[in-house]
């Protein structure tokens, strides 16, 4: 969370940004809020990126002004125009790429004053893991798969029954490069699993952490997955 202040005459305006993460190959959002101003035509929003000449996006007088926009952002950016009056200056970015990572500045000017705040935008790939029972193996084993990660994550297994146990000796993890030659498929196999136990497969890099849980009993298999972005907010 970064809060910036600005002075215009005697007026301070607070601009707040949140460290954000973008999943490459999807649309992303760079979050920025400011003190609301009901006079939409008096609001100017400028997004800038460190090391880039020209603007990422500009919104003023109630509409986009893309005349100074840098080529790498052409056709890819939007503010949430209907939310600007309530203080939302967040930027939507289409088809996030690794090269979009960096330091961005959200600059705001309103009738109350002006201010800005920086935002660190991280880009990578993250996806939900899916755990299945691998019946092909000679002994009962679990297979945890996640289709897209970057940078290369760490993978760890945990068990509800054997809390604190180290499963590195009885698991095997591989990373297979996907066709676009950036992201990788993560596959981890845990051997010698026991029935009536809940196992967790945890995949983590510096952008996201995902966990897949599986409970295998004699009568059923229960699964649950969750994903959280790290250092955001």
């Amino acid at each position: 969370l970064i809060i910036g202040f600005g002075i215009s005459g005697k007026h301070f305006i607070t601009v707040t940004t949140f460290t954000s993460a973008g999943n490459i190959g999807e649309d992303g959002t760079l979050s920025c809020t400011f003190e609301p101003d009901i006079k939409l035509n008096g609001i100017v929003i400028q997004w800038l990126k460190e090391g880039i000449k020209g603007l990422v996006h500009e919104f003023k007088e109630g509409k986009d002004d893309l005349s100074q926009q840098h080529e790498m952002f052409r056709g890819r950016t939007a503010v949430f125009a209907d939310q600007v009056v309530v203080g939302n200056a967040s930027l939507r970015l289409k088809n996030v790429q690794l090269t979009d990572a960096g330091t961005y500045t959200c600059y705001i000017r309103t009738s109350k004053g002006k201010g800005n705040a920086n935002l660190e935008y991280k880009t990578g790939a993250f996806s939900m893991p899916e755990i299945n029972v691998d019946y092909n193996a000679s002994s009962e084993s679990l297979r945890c798969e996640a289709p897209r990660w970057f940078p290369q994550p760490t993978v760890a297994w945990a068990s509800q029954v054997d809390q604190g146990a180290n499963f590195s000796e009885v698991s095997n993890t591989s990373f297979e490069l996907n066709s676009e030659n950036v992201t990788m498929k993560v596959v981890s196999v845990l051997y010698n699993v026991t029935i009536n136990n809940t196992y967790s497969c945890m995949i983590e890099n510096d952008i996201a952490k995902a966990t897949g849980d599986i409970k295998v009993t004699d009568s059923e298999v229960k699964r649950r997955s969750q994903l959280q972005l790290l250092n955001s907010g």
């Epitope: 649309d27 893309l66 052409r74 056709g75 939007a78 289409k94 088809n95 790939a125």
Partner: antibody
Framework: EVQLVESGGGLIQPGGSLRLSCAAS????????MNWVRQAPGKGLEWVSV???????DSADSVKGRFTISRDNSKNTLYLQMNSLRAEDTAVYYC??????????WGQGTTVTVSS | EIVLTQSPGTLSLSPGERATLSCRAS???????LAWYQQKPGQAPRLLIY???SRATGIPDRFSGSGSGTDFTLTISRLEPEDFAVYYC??????????FGQGTKLEIK
């Protein structure tokens, strides 16, 4: 040369299934947002489905639960699996690439006719 | 859902004249996400303008786009015989993800 070539269209009875294919050349399908857009006879363009670079998909309400977009990265090919077809699905189906700058590459289209 | 309404439905003009086609959105659309296409009978659509005002590769400079917010315009400064076709505006980014206008037919007077 950047190109998209659709195939798989034809005459099908209501309730039937069909799979359309779109072979891409000159670029990598998985790096782009790939779409299916259709055009009923004498009508305008209607977006059907998208598959993002990430592999996530989205579809128009009119086809949700019936049509599934997918891709085979090794074949650099886009697909549209169409189930429970209705007369109102009759159209020319185009695949189209969105390279951030709008739908900049289109296939020639393949015709789907749903009729008994 | 954002609805794009194009006007006029049909525009009858002669070669050499100026054509002005309008696209109005039911709510604000980002200029970045507004595009124009040309479609001739029996052919696939062709991207003309993206980002409301940027010409796509290979598009002649007689085609220009303008506008922001809810009102967008495609202008053809001097009509050539090959310009007579149907023109569609399209937006990206809301639900449904892509929305097209109903089209404007540009015909020879």
């Amino acid at each position: 040369e950047v190109q998209l070539v659709e195939s798989g269209g034809g005459l099908i009875q209501p309730g039937g299934s069909l799979r359309l294919s779109c072979a891409a050349s000159g670029f990598i399908v998985s790096r782009n947002y790939m779409n299916w857009v259709r055009q009923a006879p004498g009508k305008g363009l209607e977006w059907v489905s998208v598959i993002y670079g990430s592999g996530r998909t989205d579809s128009a309400d009119s086809v949700k639960g019936r049509f599934t977009i997918s891709r085979d990265n090794s074949k650099n090919t886009l697909y549209l699996q169409m189930n429970s077809l209705r007369a109102e699905d009759t159209a020319v189906y185009y695949c189209a690439r969105d390279a951030d700058y709008g739908l900049d590459v289109w296939g020639q289209g393949t015709t789907v006719t749903v009729s008994s | 859902e954002i609805v794009l309404t194009q006007s006029p439905g049909t525009l009858s003009l002669s070669p050499g004249e100026r054509a002005t086609l309008s696209c109005r959105a039911s709510q604000s659309v980002s200029s970045s996400y507004l595009a124009w296409y040309q479609q001739k009978p029996g052919q696939a659509p062709r991207l003309l303008i993206y980002g409301a005002s940027s010409r796509a590769t290979g598009i002649p400079d007689r085609f220009s786009g303008s506008g922001s917010g809810t009102d967008f315009t495609l202008t053809i400064s001097r009509l050539e015989p090959e310009d007579f076709a149907v023109y569609y505006c399209q937006q990206y980014g809301s639900s449904p993800l892509y929305t097209f206008g109903q089209g404007t037919k540009l015909e020879i007077k």
